[in-house]
C-alpha cells in the first residue's frame, strides 16, 4: 500500500507541474519517529488543500485514492495518541514541490518500519 502511495505522490507532482498553484503548505521536513502518525495526518490534510485549489479531477481522484490507501495502512495505529508532537499549524510553510518531497520521505519511514 505505501508503495502505491508514493506512486500517487509522483502522479500528483506530474499533474501539478502543468498548473500554476502558488499555495504554501504546512510541511514537516524532519519527522521524529514518535510523531510520524501525527505528521502523516498533517500531510494528508494539506494534500486536500492541493486538491481543492487545483480544481482538477485527476488530482482530486489521486488524492482521494492516496487517503484511502493511507487510511487502510494505518487502520491499526491511526488512533494512536502521540504526545509532544507539533500541531499542523506550527509547521513550516513550504511550496508544493518541497511539500511532496517531504511527504515521500515520511512514507518511506512507514515502509521501513512495516
Amino acid at each position: 500500500n505505501w508503495v502505491n502511495v508514493i506512486s500517487d505522490l509522483k502522479k500528483i507532482e506530474d499533474l501539478i507541474q502543468s498548473m500554476h498553484i502558488d499555495a504554501t503548505l504546512y510541511t514537516e521536513s524532519d519527522v521524529h519517529p514518535s510523531c510520524k502518525v501525527t505528521a502523516m495526518k498533517c500531510f494528508l490534510l494539506e494534500l486536500q488543500v492541493i486538491s481543492l485549489e487545483s480544481g482538477d479531477a485527476s488530482i482530486h481522484d489521486t488524492v482521494e485514492n492516496l487517503i484511502i490507501l493511507a487510511n487502510n495502512s494505518l487502520s491499526s495505529n491511526g488512533n494512536v495518541t502521540e504526545s509532544g508532537c507539533k500541531e499542523c499549524e506550527e509547521l513550516e510553510e513550504k511550496n508544493i514541490k518541497e511539500f511532496l518531497q517531504s511527504f515521500v520521505h515520511i512514507v518511506q519511514m512507514f515502509i521501513n518500519t512495516s
Epitope: 482530486h60 485514492n65 494505518l74 491511526g78
Partner: antibody
C-alpha cells in the same frame, strides 16, 4: 432530480457471467465517484465496488475481488458491473449509488438507483 | 475487516415514541485525518435505501430534524425523537472509513 436506473440483471448459472448497467441522469456524472451495493434475500446490505470520478481507481471487498469489475463511461453517463465466476451467494438485488466526495463532502452514498435482481442458480 | 454490529434487530414502537438504534464497530472508525465516515440509511418497504445521516451527525438534505445521529470512536446511535408512520422500515449503519466498507445487519422499526 438525480436519477439512477440499474438494468441487466437476470437468472444465470453458477460459473456464469453477467454485466449490469446503471444509467445516470439529472446530474454531472463525471463529478461523482460511484458504487455498487447489493442486498441479499435476507435483506443484508453488502458493499460491492466503488470507482473514482475519472475511473482510474477501483475498490472491492475480497468477496468479489478478481471476479467483479466496476467501470464507467462518462461520455455515456453510465456505470457498469461486469460479474464473472458467479456463485449462489452472489444472488441479490444490485443497487448503483452516487458517492459524495471525501474531500468536499461526507463520502456518503447520497442517491441510490432502484436495483436490478441477479439470481445465480442451476 | 471492520465488523458493524447493530442492536436491536427489531424495534417495535408506538407512533409518537422515541426510538434509538445502536451501532458498534469492531475497531475505531476515526480515519487518519480525524474524520469518522459513519452513515445511517433507511430503506422503506419496497424502496431503495436512502441516506439519512452522514459523518456521524450530519443530516442529509430534506431529512426531518426528528432524526439525529451521535457517537464517536466505536459507538454510534441514531435517535428518532417522535416516530411517524413514514419512518417505518429497515435502518442500516455503514462505515466507509476503511476498505472494505461495511454495513450493520439492519434494524427493523415496526409498529408495536
Amino acid at each position: 432530480e438525480v436519477q439512477l436506473l440499474a438494468s441487466g440483471g437476470g437468472l444465470v448459472k453458477p460459473g456464469g457471467s453477467l454485466k449490469l448497467s446503471c444509467a445516470a441522469s439529472e446530474f454531472t456524472f463525471s463529478n461523482y465517484a460511484m458504487s455498487w451495493v447489493r442486498q441479499t434475500p435476507e435483506k443484508r446490505l453488502e458493499w460491492v465496488a466503488t470507482i473514482s470520478r475519472g475511473g482510474d481507481y477501483t475498490y472491492y471487498p475480497d468477496s468479489v475481488k478478481g471476479r467483479f469489475t466496476i467501470s464507467r463511461d462518462n461520455a455515456k453517463n453510465t456505470l457498469y458491473l461486469q460479474m464473472s465466476s458467479l456463485r449462489s451467494e452472489d444472488t441479490a438485488l444490485y443497487y448503483c449509488a452516487r458517492r459524495v466526495s471525501m474531500i468536499t463532502g461526507g463520502w456518503a452514498m447520497d442517491y441510490w438507483g432502484q436495483g436490478t435482481s441477479v439470481t445465480v442458480s442451476s | 475487516d471492520v465488523l458493524m454490529t447493530q442492536t436491536p434487530l427489531s424495534l417495535p414502537v408506538s407512533l409518537g415514541d422515541q426510538a434509538s438504534i445502536s451501532c458498534r464497530s469492531s475497531q475505531s472508525i476515526v480515519d487518519i485525518t480525524g474524520n469518522t465516515y459513519l452513515e445511517w440509511y433507511l430503506q422503506k418497504p419496497g424502496q431503495s435505501p436512502k441516506l439519512l445521516i452522514y459523518k456521524v451527525f450530519n443530516r442529509f438534505s430534506g431529512v426531518p430534524d426528528r432524526f439525529s445521529g451521535s457517537g464517536s470512536g466505536t459507538d454510534f446511535t441514531l435517535k428518532i425523537s417522535r416516530v411517524e408512520a413514514e419512518d417505518l422500515g429497515l435502518y442500516y449503519c455503514f462505515q466507509d472509513s476503511f476498505v472494505p466498507y461495511t454495513f450493520g445487519g439492519g434494524t427493523k422499526l415496526e409498529i408495536k
